[in-house]
């Protein structure tokens, strides 16, 4: 079951999926001036069996100005653009992607890929949040959101991370606790 909405946005934070549940789709989007090859896939799909998950289909982009298809080449690091789900400032890996059964790793980039990846998540997907540069976590509580099915509708739980600037936190008492990998889970709400 696909999640109806995107994960929630919260002030001064970005989110990232550490691994993608089977059924997740990634749109094959190309950067400006390029388009999908005519016979190319619309999306990549995370599929698998009990022992292994991987991305089906491959995304390929070609210049809008020519009819020639381009070969898939992994761009050099300086060519790789920031993407919506990969813009975290530090690695923050609460789970080992490879060790999660039924999940795919982050797909490698493809040549002339669009600057922002568009994922279609499925129920049970978890994303993790981290404060952007210049902000810090007010508290070390859960920094995640989970797509859940409730009352027949999908919804994302509200992440409990609060990111504050240095000037904001200075007026509040209490020791600043470093942000940590999420332990508590805010997602368990009573179903119908």
């Amino acid at each position: 079951e696909l999640c109806d909405d995107d994960p929630p946005e919260i002030p001064h934070a970005t989110f990232k999926a550490m691994a993608y549940k089977e059924g997740t789709m990634l749109n094959c989007e190309c950067k400006r001036g390029f388009r999908r090859i005519k016979s190319g896939s619309l999306y990549m799909l995370c599929t698998g069996n009990s022992s292994h998950s991987s991305w089906d289909n491959q995304c390929q982009c070609t210049s809008s100005a020519t009819r020639n298809t381009t070969k898939q080449v992994t761009p050099q690091p300086e060519e790789q653009k920031e993407r919506k789900t990969t813009e975290m400032q530090s690695p923050m890996q609460p789970v080992d992607q490879a060790s999660l059964p039924g999940h795919c790793r982050e797909p490698p980039p493809w040549e002339n890929e669009a600057t922002e990846r568009i994922y279609h998540f499925v129920v049970g997907q978890m994303v993790y949040y981290q404060c952007v540069q210049g902000y810090r976590a007010l508290h070390r509580g859960p920094a995640e959101s989970v797509c859940k099915m409730t009352h027949g509708k999908t919804r994302w739980t509200q992440p409990q991370l609060i990111c504050t600037g240095e000037m904001e936190t200075s007026q509040f008492p209490g020791e600043e606790k470093p942000q940590a990998s999420p332990e508590g889970r805010p997602e368990s709400e009573t179903s119908c």
Partner: antibody
Framework: EVQLVQSGAEVKKPGESLKISCKGS????????IVWVRQMPGKGLEWMGI????????RYSPSFQGQVTFSADKSISTAYLQWSSLKASDTAMYYC?????????WGQGTLVTVSS | DIQMTQSPSTLSASVGDRVTITCRAS??????LAWYQQKPGKAPKLLIY???SLESGVPSRFSGSGSGTEFTLTISSLQPDDFATYYC?????????FGQGTKVEIK
């Protein structure tokens, strides 16, 4: 169903202490911030601060710092707001809500009246 | 703290009217703004979050817009159930703050 149920109305004298409660159900109470909001008679909403039930971490609005104390007991899914010495100006309706950003669920409110 | 200023303080309107309430922030808060409705003797109810996202179960006649420092709550066709006080709240800069409220009364 998510619910926040607050303790009943209180009538107190100036200088007395008081602790009011907010019990959550229908969700993982320990892992959601609880926000406290004051509404003085005929006035608007005032954001007092926030408490995290899992470890009782608290942050107060500057206006309420030193005036009140937040606490929580996650084992009984209850958050508390307390005063050590009430003043007449503490007369108000107090709401607990589920945070941390906007408040999607609210308690019914506890009316605190302080009068000599 | 960021100051939130609502206008008007009181608004007289009739059923069926289009009603607009404005909320201004003392500094930019991006789109981190919520709107609430409160009826006498009741707890407030969340209507809008992130400036324009309608909370589940809220009628579509309510809408929010704006970003930065100026925001509006619009009721496209005022219903009898909509006579109440409306509050905005910013959640960009900790600690969060409310506007002083706008009372929508029957003309």
């Amino acid at each position: 169903e998510v619910q926040l149920v607050q303790s009943g109305a209180e009538v107190k004298k100036p200088g007395e202490s008081l602790k009011i409660s907010c019990k959550g159900s229908g969700y993982n109470f320990a892992n959601y911030w609880i926000v406290w909001v004051r509404q003085m008679p005929g006035k608007g909403l005032e954001w007092m601060g926030i408490t995290y039930p899992d470890d009782s971490e608290t942050r107060y609005s500057p206006s309420f710092q030193g005036q009140v104390t937040f606490s929580a007991d996650k084992s009984i899914s209850t958050a508390y707001l307390q005063w050590s010495s009430l003043k007449a100006s503490d007369t108000a309706m107090y709401y607990c809500t589920r945070g941390p950003y906007y408040s999607d669920y609210w308690g019914q409110g506890t009316l605190v009246t302080v009068s000599s | 703290d960021i100051q939130m200023t609502q206008s008007p303080s009181t608004l007289s309107a009739s059923v069926g009217d289009r009603v607009t309430i404005t909320c201004r922030a003392s500094q930019s808060i991006s789109s981190w703004l919520a709107w609430y409705q409160q009826k006498p003797g009741k707890a407030p109810k969340l209507l809008i979050y992130k400036a324009s996202s309608l909370e589940s179960g809220v009628p579509s006649r309510f809408s929010g817009s704006g970003s930065g420092t100026e925001f509006t709550l619009t009721i496209s066709s005022l219903q009898p159930d909509d006579f109440a006080t409306y509050y905005c709240q910013q959640y960009d800069r900790f600690s969060w703050t409310f506007g002083q409220g706008t009372k929508v009364e029957i003309k």
